[in-house]
């Protein structure tokens, strides 16, 4: 659970994060697992520890091995292990499987390829991107922040994509490359103005005071992968996060795909221990995409005791 595989190429920078995380103020000690020898924190060393990070600047094949990190909070010491493998540079263009990060898939509507592990490094834009070792050129390719966007994705855009960037440490520059496969989903998708499936507009829901109730906001946005599709609840026109009432919590949006192929998202508003004042609120289900915003309002009313008895 608290062991993590990391890999890199010789003569490149490699930065590894301790699998046990904690506050930045927690002391983190790093050791070579085999020898129990402490890893120095002085930056003049080629391999040194910097808080939760272990830095190889640059890495050598001989650095391969298991490293122990101990995160020392005021109350507990928690141990993690980083299993590091440094490989020799490949003479040819082929990137072996063991150097590949997780595969990502995209479609015509969503073609972002994130550069793996880049958030660990001190880098500056732009990134360089390569496909099957060829530098990417042309207006279809846009390097944006830490990802690559491909316009009008086609099936032959599938392949291995490598990002290359420079890590800067105290004025010294080190090269880093990372490769992942990109697959293309052949999807005849489309996007349209949001359609809210639930609740109905101006609906009223009967609730019992003191009971728990759930309100579901469900909307569909078209077919296939959507570039932007969001649903959320608002209370009296305010975001849930701005409404300081822990009894009322919104769940993360859940993606759904119905039998008709529609791309839909829903989110549940959970209201615990319903109170009288909850009946005075306006609950808005908001659905948003690039076409615009649709809003359905629902209110709560007290369940009629006569109905309850029947």
């Amino acid at each position: 659970k608290f062991s993590k595989q990391s890999w890199g190429l010789e003569n490149e920078a490699l930065i590894v994060r301790c699998p046990r995380q904690g506050k930045s103020s927690y002391i983190v000690d790093w050791y070579y697992s085999q020898t129990n020898k402490s890893i120095p924190t002085q930056e003049r060393n080629r391999v040194f520890a910097s808080g939760q990070l272990l830095k190889f600047l640059p890495a050598e094949v001989a650095d391969s091995g298991i490293y122990t990190c101990i995160v020392r909070s005021p109350t507990f010491n928690r141990t993690g292990y980083a299993n590091v493998t440094i490989y020799k540079k490949q003479p040819d263009c082929n990137v072996p499987d063991y150097l590949m990060y997780s595969t990502v898939s995209g479609s015509e509507k969503n073609s972002k390829i994130y550069c793996p592990t880049i958030d660990l490094y001190n880098w500056t834009a732009p990134l360089e991107w390569f496909k099957n070792c060829q530098a990417l050129q042309g207006s279809r390719y846009k390097a944006h922040k830490s990802f690559l966007v491909i316009d009008n994705v086609m099936t032959d855009d599938a392949g291995d994509y490598t990002c290359k960037f420079i890590h800067n440490e105290n004025g010294a520059n080190y090269s880093v490359t990372a490769t992942r496969s990109f697959t293309v989903k052949d999807e005849q998708g489309f996007s349209r103005f949001p359609v809210i499936r639930a609740p109905a507009h101006n609906e009223t829901k009967e609730v019992e005071i003191g009971e728990n109730t759930n309100l579901t906001c469900s909307a569909c946005f078209g077919k296939g992968a959507q570039f932007l599709a969001a649903v959320q609840w608002q209370l009296n026109g305010n975001k849930i996060t701005d409404f300081s009432e822990p009894r009322i919590q919104q769940e993360e949006g859940q993606n759904q795909s119905f039998s008709d192929g529609l791309a839909c998202v829903n989110t549940v508003l959970r209201i615990a221990d319903v109170k009288e004042e909850d009946l005075l609120l306006r609950y808005d289900c908001l659905a948003l995409n690039l076409h615009g915003l649709r809003r359905h309002t629902i209110r709560l009313s007290r369940k009629n005791p006569i109905d309850h008895q029947s």
Epitope: R20, Q21, G22, K23, S25, S73, P74, T75, F76
Partner: antibody, heavy 121, light 107 residues
């Protein structure tokens, strides 16, 4: 949603022991520390100690060490605090509270409703 | 143990006023300070963590600042529902310790 449900009020004799429970729901019990806090009108809030439910490791405030014992049952997602050799000074409301140590917010973000303990002969 | 000295103990203010509570640590606690609100008959609620980060759902009239030994908690425009006791707490070193609390009353 996250909830910490504490056991009911206790009336105990001086010298006796009491065990309070705190049942967690709505999150992965082993991903957060469980802390216990004592509150009295005179002394305000006092940190008793904490348990890591994943490992069973504990840490105590020296003030309570030897008298407070924290345990956790992963199967029922319940944390317990036993307080022994009770005196009238132990009359207080006791809270269990969840503490995130791996990511923000680093703090006691959810609290139980509290258990009132009265020590009296 | 780190002693958290919180002042004032009591505050009597009018709705709309700006309120400032201070907490002084007996030694440096970096920015490992949280602020809690406890309304009458309720459990404490986390408002601010890491000295200045507002917890989810907390209105932006509540702010925190400070580093090292001196910390400040401010309510910019006090509302009637802010009637409560406010506590600071450090979790930089064990045992974790709380301030004595500030009781806020509305005129």
């Amino acid at each position: 949603q996250v909830q910490l449900q504490q056991s009911g009020a206790e009336l105990v004799r001086p010298g006796a022991s009491v065990t309070l429970s705190c049942k967690a729901s709505g999150y992965t019990f082993t991903d957060y520390e469980m802390h216990w806090v004592k509150q009295t009108p005179v002394h305000g809030l006092d940190w008793i100690g904490t348990i890591d439910p994943e490992t069973g490791d504990t840490a105590y405030n020296q003030k309570f060490k030897g008298r407070a014992t924290l345990t956790a049952d992963k199967s029922s997602s319940t944390a317990y605090m036993e307080l022994s050799s009770l005196t009238s000074e132990d009359s207080a409301v006791y809270y269990c509270t969840r503490y995130s140590y791996t990511n923000s917010p680093y703090g006691m973000d959810y609290w139980g409703q509290g258990t009132s303990v009265t020590v009296s002969s | 143990d780190v002693v958290m000295t919180q002042t004032p103990k009591f505050l009597l203010v009018s709705a709309g006023d700006r309120v400032t509570i201070t907490c002084k640590a007996s030694q440096s606690v970096s920015n490992d300070v949280a602020w809690y609100q406890q309304k009458p008959g309720q459990s404490p609620k986390l408002l601010i963590y890491y000295a200045s980060n507002r917890y989810t759902g907390v209105p932006d009239r509540f702010t925190g600042s400070g580093y090292g030994t001196d910390f400040t908690f401010t309510i910019n425009t006090v509302q009637a529902e802010d009637l409560a006791v406010y506590f600071c707490q450090q979790d930089y070193s064990s045992p974790y310790t709380f301030g004595g609390g500030t009781k806020l009353e509305i005129k």
